[in-house]
Interface confidence: medium
Amino acid sequence: HLNLTARQQDPEDTPQTDEGDDRVWCHVCERENTFECENPRRCQWTEPYCVIAAVKIFPRFFIISKQCSASCAAIEIPKPEEKRFLLEEPLPFFYLKCCKTRYCNLQGPAINTSSFKEYAG
């Protein structure tokens, strides 16, 4: 959530508001046909993950959602920091990123939107 927005901890800069509170900071927003949205929020204790999910509505049209999440099927051991993958039919989700570091769900896949729309087709 939007506590005059989010912060990361610098070694030389640790006010009490940064101490003893390891809740993750994520972006929480939704957009059509683009991954470009940002809305920094601190997640609840019960939501330790950031996610981006892209959902195909119909060919060449998708909606992305950036959220805090209580769980993450995409996290694997022994590399818990992040996993991205594309999902095939018949699942409507065709891109998912799940991660645990501050603002880690800001960016989507490393391909441009038009290429991504082609994939969504």
Epitope: N3, T5, R7, D10, P15, T17, P40
Partner: antibody
């Protein structure tokens, strides 16, 4: 230590624009969102919007939409707030505030008067 | 927009008094609430964050409680230096909004 230093007081005529700067030091500038808040005489605090010094992304309060522009210059760790089409009721103290609200600039008084 | 209704708007009080200010949100904001102190010519000072956490360096005379829509800010024993205007602020959703403020005066 963290410091936010704002530009000096401004006197403007109605219809003009004003650009207030906020120079940050003592922390990683691109790691923290910056907000602008104003306080008009005899009124409360009014949130204007935020800017991401990292991406340059912005989010403005509806009441300032179309009149406010927030920008940043990462090379000098400075954010700017420009307010256009000034009216007399824009006379206020303008503050930059880092993220959580535990660090604020000293405020910049903008007076709009004909 | 989330409306923050703060009361009272002003309070005449005496040194040593217990002071209570309330803030009501127009919808559930969890615990996403700050309390600020504002003195003339000075920048706002964060006192309480996340509704009940005392910011470092802030006197323990100040405390906050509440969650959801109803919040309370308390000064256990008012001191002369506490004379100021106090604001609540929600940061659950944009736009960030403030209460209208509570001005403390000495009787």
């Amino acid at each position: 230590q963290v410091q936010l230093v704002q530009s000096g007081a401004e006197v403007k005529k109605p219809g003009a624009s004003v650009k207030v700067s906020c120079k940050a030091s003592g922390y990683t500038f691109t790691g923290y969102y910056m907000h602008w808040v104003r306080q008009a005489p005899g009124t409360g605090l009014d949130w204007m919007g935020w800017i991401s010094p990292n991406s340059g992304g912005t989010n403005y309060a509806q009441k300032f939409q179309g009149r406010v522009t927030m920008t940043r210059d990462t090379s000098i760790s400075t954010v700017y707030m420009e307010l256009s089409r000034l009216r007399s009721d824009d006379t206020a103290l303008y503050y930059c505030a880092r993220e959580v609200g535990n660090y604020w600039g000293q405020g910049t008084l903008v007076t709009v008067s004909s | 927009d989330i409306q923050m209704t703060q009361s009272p708007t002003s309070l005449s009080t005496s040194v040593g008094d217990r002071v209570t200010i309330t803030c009501q949100a127009s919808q559930d904001i969890y615990n996403y609430l700050n309390w600020y102190q504002l003195k003339p010519g000075k920048a706002p000072k964060l006192l309480i964050y996340d509704a009940s956490n005392l910011e470092r360096g802030v006197t323990s005379r100040f405390s906050g409680s509440g969650s959801g829509t109803d919040f309370t800010f308390t000064i256990s024993s008012l001191q002369p230096e506490d004379i100021a205007t106090y604001y609540c602020q929600q940061y659950d959703s944009l736009p960030i909004t403030f209460g209208q403020g509570t001005r403390l005066e000495i009787k």
